[in-house]
Interface confidence: medium
């Protein structure tokens, strides 16, 4: 049935899917607060531009009776059920914010003829790449893959003089939603990462990982895993690690590394942490108090989704253009808008660009230090610390294959 969009005559509505199954276990109240905070700013921006219009959000809740796993496993049907609810109510906003699970986003995109934009805080998987009306406001797996390939190939930095072409990937199936799809992308045999590497093996058991740490016959010195330091400690403990092992710990949505009083534990000395630049982290705002750093990023993505809609609405209204058109639905990409804590850039496919930061543990200070940054928008690495105080020999990252000479 044809669903009418509440999106004209000076009244513009945002449909926010409040799904029980979510990329991060965040109380829906916090997401509501984030959306309401965003609405307040959008109204101010539109008013400042002389646009006397009404912008509101409608929160669509699922009944939670059937799809109650709380994680993303049963999100596919929940997303479609919510769309059915919208269809039955014959009421849809100008834009759909949510869902965050890759499964639900993929299925909703596939099963609906959407003539409106969909904004997601999540949907990390490769299956959500290159969707014409989907915008993703948290770094998707594709961005991680491009960084890793870029870093593997780099061989002209004072601290990295070897190109790498091998890796182990640790993936045991208990990962969070973001990590699950990041590692899934690295594992996929048809992905860019797999295509560019000569050797890649997935370690699925704790024992496999632990054995590699001291195995003289290992095929690579590099192990990629995803999670926080505590996750690594549970796995690695205080076991001895061969001196040329490098663990890459992907922990994008965690800015605890940048807090002043944080000391890196000893087990992190062989580890490079890949995280996002903290930017203007949100402290004590209505939707982020009492949140973990990860959840703060999730709530912020919801808020920025509202600001993005406001940005596009302003442009279209100022140009006298209709909002309920395919042109509007396809416009949420290749742009920069003013996010809550600074400019947010979206690439040609509507995916957020960001600055990734690679950290190492200084053997002198036991602090996390920035080794390099990587701009996902231009696919370029920028060294920061030209003489890092590494644990590795000669303060250089080792070759990825033991015993192999200079490349």
């Amino acid at each position: 049935s044809q669903v009418s969009q509440n999106c004209h005559n000076g009244s513009y509505e945002i449909s926010v899917l409040m799904m029980g199954n979510s990329a991060f276990a965040e109380p829906l109240k916090n997401l509501e607060d984030a959306v309401n905070e965003g609405l307040e700013i959008v109204r101010g921006r539109l008013q400042n531009a002389g646009l006397n219009v009404t912008v509101n959000a409608t929160f669509m809740y699922s009944d939670g009776l059937i799809h109650n796993s709380g994680d993303c496993r049963s999100s596919t049907c929940e997303g479609l059920d919510l769309l059915r609810k919208i269809s039955n109510a014959q009421r849809m906003g100008c834009v759909l914010i949510g869902p965050s699970c890759t499964y639900s986003t993929f299925q909703m995109y596939l099963d609906t003829e959407l003539s409106y934009p969909m904004i997601s805080a999540g949907s990390f998987g490769l299956s959500c790449d290159y969707k014409e009306t989907l915008t993703r406001l948290m770094s998707p797996a594709r961005k991680l893959m491009y960084f890793l390939v870029n870093f593997w190939k780099t061989n002209d930095l004072p601290f990295k003089t070897y190109s790498w072409s091998t890796s182990y990937v640790y993936k045991n199936g208990t990962e969070t939603e973001d990590c699950f799809w990041y590692l899934n992308a690295l594992e996929a045999s048809v992905s860019y990462f797999s295509h560019e590497l000569g050797f890649k093996v997935v370690l699925r058991q704790d024992k496999e990982f632990q054995d590699i740490l001291m195995d003289h016959n290992r095929k690579s010195n590099v192990i990629i895993m995803c999670g926080g330091p505590e996750f690594l400690y549970k796995l690695k403990g205080d076991r001895a690690v061969a001196e040329d092992i490098v663990i890459i710990l992907v922990d994008l949505f965690n800015d605890q590394y940048f807090e002043d009083n944080v000391t890196a534990p000893d087990y992190m000395k062989n580890v490079l942490v890949l995280t996002l630049s903290p930017g203007n982290s949100l402290l004590n705002s209505s939707f982020s108090r009492n949140l973990s750093p990860t959840k703060r990023d999730f709530a912020l993505a919801y808020l920025n989704g509202i600001l993005l809609f406001g940005h596009m609405l302003k442009i279209f209204l100022e140009n006298g253009e209709n909002i309920t058109t395919p042109k509007f639905a396809h416009a949420f990409r290749n742009l920069t808008f003013e996010g809550y804590d600074g400019p947010v850039t979206l690439d040609d496919w509507g995916d957020v660009d960001s600055t990734m930061v690679l950290l190492y543990t200084s053997v002198d200070t036991k602090k996390y230090k920035v080794l390099l940054t990587y701009d996902t928008h231009v696919n370029k690495t920028y060294p920061v610390d030209m003489s890092p105080t590494f644990t590795w020999k000669n303060s250089k990252l080792p070759n990825d294959i033991t015993g192999r000479g200079p490349q």
């Epitope: 700013i41 921006r45 400042n48 982290s281 949100l282 004590n284 705002s285 108090r289 809550y340 804590d341």
Partner: nanobody, 115 residues
Framework: QVQLVESGGGLVQPGGSLRLSCTAS????????MSWVRQAPGKGLEWVAK????????YYVDSVKGRFTISRDNAKNSLYLQMNSLRAEDTAVYYC????????WGQGTAVTVSS
Amino acid sequence: QVQLVESGGGLVQPGGSLRLSCTASGFTFSRYWMSWVRQAPGKGLEWVAKIRHDGGEKYYVDSVKGRFTISRDNAKNSLYLQMNSLRAEDTAVYYCATDYTRDVWGQGTAVTVSS
């Protein structure tokens, strides 16, 4: 820990002016949006004005537009509210906050507009 100290309130006649100040500590002030919030006697909290971390955006409740100006000095960790053409209905305790529903509050500064 986060601390906010408001000052500058007082008794003023209708049509008069006051400048409120708020000094912040315990967090990186220059990274966050800041707000002024007020509570009139016997009433609930009302958001008054809001300013972006770099001062690039400012928003006001309709009732104070054109009369109040919010500003900040990140080098001094300070937030200001210049209040002109004051009216009796502006009488309230004024608080600064990083957000109007947040948990940490200063003691506020009382503004009384009366002849």
